[in-house]
């Protein structure tokens, strides 16, 4: 079942998927100036049996003014600069998704690729949440929405996370150092924070994840 | 289960100081920021100040900047904060609340007066 | 002065649904932040009521329910009893102060 709408918009924060599951779907989209070939795919599938999952189709663009180029090459290094990427700059990435079963690694760049990609998720994906450049997060950890089916309806969960601007600086004289904390994600206690909206962190996903505060207690 | 208990309230001079201190306990303190929030009496709730999981940044109300500190001792899963200067209008009860906040504890009463 | 308005209050009689209104700004609501209702009886803490926009925390009855859209959100509340009596904040994080923005509050008197 594909979920109804995109994963939900976090200011200051940009979201990733580690992994597809299976019936997800890739658009395949050409960067301006290309085409897809006349008889290429629409999208890219991601399918797969019990023990192993992989693209079908193959996205394959053309110049607009050229009929009949249809080579496919990957990408030179200044054209996947080119790719608007996602992908988290953080020491804390989660368990790697993609080697559990049903699921599809993100696919290979194809030539002359459009500079955003466009997913259609299927119920059951999650995806993950991380302040860009110059902003932090207020909670540690990943952030996490995962499109769910209530009541015959999909939605998606909202990821607990606040990403805030420049530091203030506020150590006053005599104020102690703030201390360093270990990355990574932190045991949990007894319970779980709610911090499960903007000023939090949410789920647990394998051993290393840690749920909100209360918020896990509440979805 | 959570548990948030508020201490170091009670009567001070205006000018004085006082040191407000929040004992966590039932969650992992470590991975939350924290907040101060306080309610004068009859009042609304006004959020004071603002502090990362790790103490690494801190935000503060307008109409404390200057005169409250906030802290976290993460080893001692405790947050404080220092008010220097303090004025009536700083009367309130004061609340220490954890993530959204989504929980609060039971609060500590300062009055300043002479 | 507020950052985020609120009726200072609301009544109802039991069994009647009751709306609270909140407004932001765009530096809050209408930033794309979460919004979260608090409800506070009298003489304790505020107490977590609706967490992002729309959820209910375990043990919150599906009498309460929030919505967003735009620069502003409410809350409702069906089904009026009279333990409903209490004061109802909303809260919001703004990216101008990067803090939590409060509501003045809303008094519900059940009549």
């Known amino acids: 079942e594909l979920c109804d709408d995109d994963p939900p918009e976090i200011p200051h924060a940009t979201f990733k998927a580690m992994a597809y599951k299976e019936g997800t779907m890739l658009n395949c989209e050409c960067k301006r100036g290309f085409r897809r070939i006349k008889s290429g795919s629409l999208y890219m599938l991601c399918t797969g049996n019990s023990s192993h999952s992989s693209w079908d189709n193959q996205c394959q663009c053309t110049s607009s003014a050229t009929r009949n180029t249809t080579k496919q090459v990957t990408p030179q290094p200044e054209e996947q600069k080119e790719r608007k990427t996602t992908e988290m700059q953080s020491p804390m990435q989660p368990v790697d998704q993609a080697s559990l079963p049903g699921h599809c690694r993100e696919p290979p760049p194809w030539e002359n690729e459009a500079t955003e990609r466009i997913y259609h998720f299927v119920v059951g994906q999650m995806v993950y949440y991380q302040c860009v450049q110059g902003y932090r997060a207020l909670h540690r950890g990943p952030a996490e929405s995962v499109c769910k089916m209530t009541h015959g309806k999909t939605r998606w969960t909202q990821p607990q996370l606040i990403c805030t601007g420049e530091m203030e600086t506020s150590q006053f004289p005599g104020e102690e150092k703030p201390q360093a904390s270990p990355e990574g994600r932190p045991e949990s206690e007894t319970s779980c924070l709610v911090t499960t909206t903007d000023f939090q962190i949410q789920t647990e996903m394998a051993a290393t994840m840690e749920t909100s505060i209360f918020t896990t207690e509440y979805q | 289960e959570v548990q948030l208990l508020e201490s170091g309230g009670g009567l001070v001079q205006p000018g004085g100081s006082l040191r407000l201190s929040c004992a966590a306990s039932?969650?992992?303190?470590?991975?939350?920021?924290m907040h101060w929030v306080r309610q004068a009496p009859g009042k609304g709730l006004e959020w004071v100040s603002v502090?990362?999981?790790?103490?690494?940044?801190?935000y503060y109300a307008d109409s404390v900047k200057g005169r409250f500190t906030i802290s976290r001792d993460n080893s001692k899963n405790t947050l404080y904060l220092q008010m220097n200067s303090l004025r009536a209008e700083d009367t309130a009860v004061y609340y220490c609340?954890?993530?959204?906040?989504?929980?609060w504890g039971q609060g500590t009463l300062v009055t300043v007066s002479s | 002065q507020s950052v985020l308005t609120q009726p200072p209050s609301a009544s109802g009689t039991p069994g009647q649904r009751v709306t609270i209104s909140c407004t932001g700004s765009?530096?809050?609501?209408?930033?794309?932040?979460?919004v979260h209702w608090y409800q506070q009886l009298p003489g304790t803490a505020p107490k977590l009521l609706i967490y992002?926009?729309?959820e209910r925390p375990s043990g919150v009855p599906d009498r309460f329910s929030g919505s967003k859209s735009g620069t502003s959100a409410s809350l409702a509340i069906s089904g009026l009893r009279s333990e409903d009596e209490a004061d109802y904040y909303c809260?919001?994080?703004?990216?101008?102060?990067?803090?939590?923005?409060f509501g003045g509050g809303t008094k519900l008197t059940v009549l």
């Open positions: 609340a954890a993530g959204v906040p989504d929980y």
């Open positions: 039932g969650f992992t303190f470590s991975s939350y920021g």
């Open positions: 502090i990362s999981y790790d103490g690494s940044y801190k």
């Open positions: 765009s530096s809050n609501i209408g930033a794309g932040y979460d």
């Open positions: 992002s926009n729309n």
């Open positions: 809260a919001a994080w703004d990216q101008s102060l990067n803090g939590p923005v």
